[in-house]
């Protein structure tokens, strides 16, 4: 999906208002220095591409974050503010709901969410630069 036509201001508002709080809650008990940020992004569409991938694509050691509250809110925000997102992405992420067996917060998942926080912060920074 090409995130170029999203309403970035509205996505930022939703992130700051609610998604960020859920990400921080998920990370509670860990320090920001516990993980190194290895994933980066260069502009707003690129940041959303990386956020989409890290939130909804299962990885070997973190099966799926897609059912977490922050992920559900991320999906709702992208569906609302990125025309065409739902048609191309929602069906693809439905399968991941079924893939998830048990809700275990592994260290690898914490690391992945730490990367997500970094990507979102980068998204906000690139937004500020543009204004």
């Amino acid at each position: 999906y090409d995130f170029t036509n999203c309403d970035f201001q509205k996505i930022e508002a939703d992130y700051l208002r609610t998604i960020s709080k859920d990400l921080i809650t998920y990370m509670s008990g860990t320090k920001s220095t516990d993980f190194n940020n290895t994933v980066s992004c260069s502009n707003r569409p690129h940041c959303l591409t990386e956020i989409q991938s890290l939130t909804f694509n299962p990885t070997p050691r973190c099966a799926s974050l897609a059912k977490e509250m922050f992920a559900r809110k991320t999906k709702a925000t992208l569906a609302l503010w990125c025309p065409g997102y739902s048609e191309t992405q929602i069906n693809a992420t439905q399968a991941m709901k079924k893939a998830r067996k048990s809700k275990v917060t592994t260290n690898k998942c914490l690391e992945q969410v730490s990367q997500l926080l970094g990507l979102w912060r980068r998204f906000i920074r690139t937004l500020l630069k543009k204004q």
Epitope: D7, D14, T18, R72, A76, A79, S86, E87, I90
Partner: antibody, heavy 120, light 111 residues
């Protein structure tokens, strides 16, 4: 059963406010969009705004910005629409409608409608 | 004045086909594949008949079909039946600011 049940008819004076409720049952309230649509007597449909309870923040049609307030209470699966500074032209049937999950712009479930009459 | 333009009325005899048009612009119908159609009987709430241009929700007869060309969407009702007599409204997504627009409605009469 999957349904939206709205509050009863209201008669209001010009300049006052009205608050209509819409109680959802039979589905996960949070991730759907709840829109409000009105229909004046003998007229067409008009979209007022939407709220996704999961996100909690409403978005309004420009025409109603500043006059309409849409809220949602996830604990009771109820959405509310308040319209202020009422005038006679606001006399209409007000519907709440469910926007499909993550496809918020088409409405697959409607409330029964609430008639709001504005008259002095 | 509605942002989407529909003919005020349409009619046909039982068994015939009738097509209702809905004209918008590049900012709504022409820009997105997010057109839906609603049927409304007098005194009742609208009912979704078609979404995403041509998809039918379960329970809607296959006599109802939708299409789109450029800035115009169409609803076709084939094999008209008496119960099809109702008002029909088109709707389109119109971007993140306007969100949803409706047509003015078309009264379908089964002769």
């Amino acid at each position: 059963q999957v349904q939206l049940v709205q509050s009863g008819a209201e008669v209001k004076k010009p300049g006052s406010s009205v608050k209509v409720s819409c109680k959802a049952s039979g589905f996960t309230f949070g991730s759907y969009g709840i829109s409000w649509v009105r229909q004046a007597p003998g007229q067409g449909l008009e979209w007022l705004g939407v709220i996704i309870p999961l996100l909690g923040v409403p978005n309004y049609a420009e025409k109603f910005q500043g006059r309409v307030t849409i809220t949602a209470d996830t604990s009771t699966s109820t959405a509310y629409m308040e319209l202020s500074s009422l005038r006679s032209e606001d006399t209409a049937v007000y519907y709440c409608a469910r926007g499909a999950e993550y496809f918020y712009w088409y409405f697959d479930l409607w409330g029964q409608g609430t008639l709001v009459t504005v008259s002095s | 004045q509605s942002a989407l333009t529909q003919p005020p009325s349409a009619s046909g005899s039982p068994g015939q086909s009738v097509t209702i048009s809905c004209t918008g612009s590049n900012s709504d119908i022409g820009g997105y594949n997010r057109v839906s159609w609603y049927q409304q009987h007098p005194g009742k709430a609208p009912k979704l008949m078609i979404y995403e241009i041509s998809k039918r929700p379960s329970g809607v007869p296959d006599r109802f079909s939708g299409s789109k060309s450029g800035n115009t969407a169409s609803l076709t009702v084939s094999g008209l039946q008496a119960e099809d007599e109702a008002d029909y409204y088109c709707s389109s997504y119109a971007g993140t600011d306007t969100f949803v627009l409706f047509g003015g409605g078309t009264k379908l009469t089964v002769l």
